[in-house]
């Protein structure tokens, strides 16, 4: 069971200081972006991080969605990386599910952050180059210290 | 909703070029998620990719066909081509412009297919 | 590069009863690019079904995908009419793309 708590605007970045964005197709892309135009593409560059207590605590549960015409929520459904026209829930009354994310700080790295699927255990958000684009992807941590399924996560509020 | 449609000759002779342009209409060759495909498929047999343009134009092409293969693209006509050199009979073939859906590498749309003769 | 086989070749059934294809892939598949078309006959094939189980719009719910690591199935419940055609899976890896063979539904 997941209760929804309170609500964040980030702006999330991979190691390599790329930024998160929404593009008009509705797809999580990774580019390089200067701050002000970080600033230009809001809200494709603001994500809401709305957080979730967890009737069984493995980490911060939260769900990741955007508001430019409507609001959008992040799914990992069969481990395919999209955004579905939805709010965020006030409840789940499960304990996986495919918009639940567990946010955990890196061990030894406080400001860097991964997300791990609560419907694919082992399984992580990441960024990963296929053909020209930087892709928001779902990947099964392979190796310690894997760069591309940490983040840093700044606060917008 | 996006429609492509494919036009060019459809008798080529042997050790020609064949030359092939698709047409995309309702959306923007120029999106950044979308790559633009040509897929064959000879009478009576199965589909064969030959490869795929991104709007940027860089090209990702079949092992099989790369070396005879050629893919383009006009952002300003919103369309892509594709050349395939030295045919011969084995290149007989309806051939395919799709839109490809980079989220999960998919060909969502597709034209309605032009066949392409290889014969003099 | 990844080859796709599929089985049977073809199948024949009477509507109403359940067609199940398979697909297996020449290695286990790292990301679930794993897709399924429908193709009639004088038409350009239609997507069904993408990232192994996901259907694509518009598509009925008769109509899933199913599987994991090198083998996938596409299964038909309750044949329709209007089902009886080419299926093909299509897999994408390393930036390249390919199909399975096909395999023809046909009535009984």
């Known amino acids: 069971y997941f209760g929804k708590l309170e609500s964040k605007l980030s702006v999330i970045r991979n190691l390599n200081d790329q930024v998160l964005f929404i593009d008009q197709g509705n797809r999580p892309l990774f580019e390089d972006m200067t701050d002000s135009d970080c600033r230009d593409n809001a809200p494709r560059t603001i994500f809401i991080i709305s957080m979730y207590k967890d009737s069984q605590p493995r980490g911060m549960a939260v769900t990741i969605s955007v508001k430019c015409e409507k609001i959008s929520t992040l799914s990992c459904e069969n481990k395919i990386i999209s955004f579905k026209e939805m709010n965020p829930p006030d409840n789940i009354k499960d304990t996986k599910s495919d918009i639940i994310f567990f946010q955990r700080s890196v061990p030894g790295h406080d400001n860097k952050m991964q997300f791990e699927s609560s419907s694919y255990e082992g399984y992580f958000l990441a960024c990963e180059k296929e053909r020209d684009l930087f892709k928001l992807i779902l990947k099964k941590e392979d190796e310690l210290g894997d760069r591309s399924i940490m983040f840093t996560v700044q606060n917008e509020d | 909703q996006t429609q492509l449609q494919e036009s060019g000759p459809g008798l080529v002779k042997p050790s020609e070029t064949l030359s092939l342009t698709c047409t995309v209409s309702g959306g923007s060759i120029s999106s950044r998620v979308y790559y633009w495909g040509w897929i064959r498929q000879p009478p009576g047999k199965g589909l064969e990719w030959i490869g795929s343009i991104y709007y940027s134009g860089s090209t990702y092409y079949s092992p099989s066909l790369k070396s005879r293969v050629t893919i383009s693209v006009d952002t300003s006509k919103n369309q892509f081509s594709l050349k395939l050199s030295s045919v011969t009979a084995a290149d007989t073939a309806i051939y395919y412009c799709?839109?490809?859906?980079?989220?999960?590498?998919?060909?969502?749309?597709w034209g309605q297919g032009t066949l392409v003769t290889v014969s003099s | 590069e990844i080859v796709l086989t599929q089985s049977p070749d073809t199948l024949s059934l009477s509507p109403g009863e359940r067609a199940t294809l398979s697909c297996r892939a020449s290695?286990?598949?790292?990301?679930?690019?794993l897709a399924w078309y429908q193709q009639k006959p004088g038409q350009a094939p239609r997507l069904l079904i993408y990232g192994i189980s996901i259907r694509a719009t518009g598509i009925p719910d008769r109509f899933s995908g199913s599987g994991s690591g090198a083998d996938f199935t596409l299964t038909i419940n309750r044949l329709e009419p209007e089902d009886f055609a080419v299926y093909y899976c299509q897999h994408y890896d390393n930036s390249l793309c390919s199909f399975g063979q096909g395999t023809k539904l046909e009535v009984k």
């Open positions: 290695q286990i598949l790292s990301r679930n690019y």
């Open positions: 799709a839109r490809e859906d980079s989220s999960a590498w998919v060909f969502e749309h």
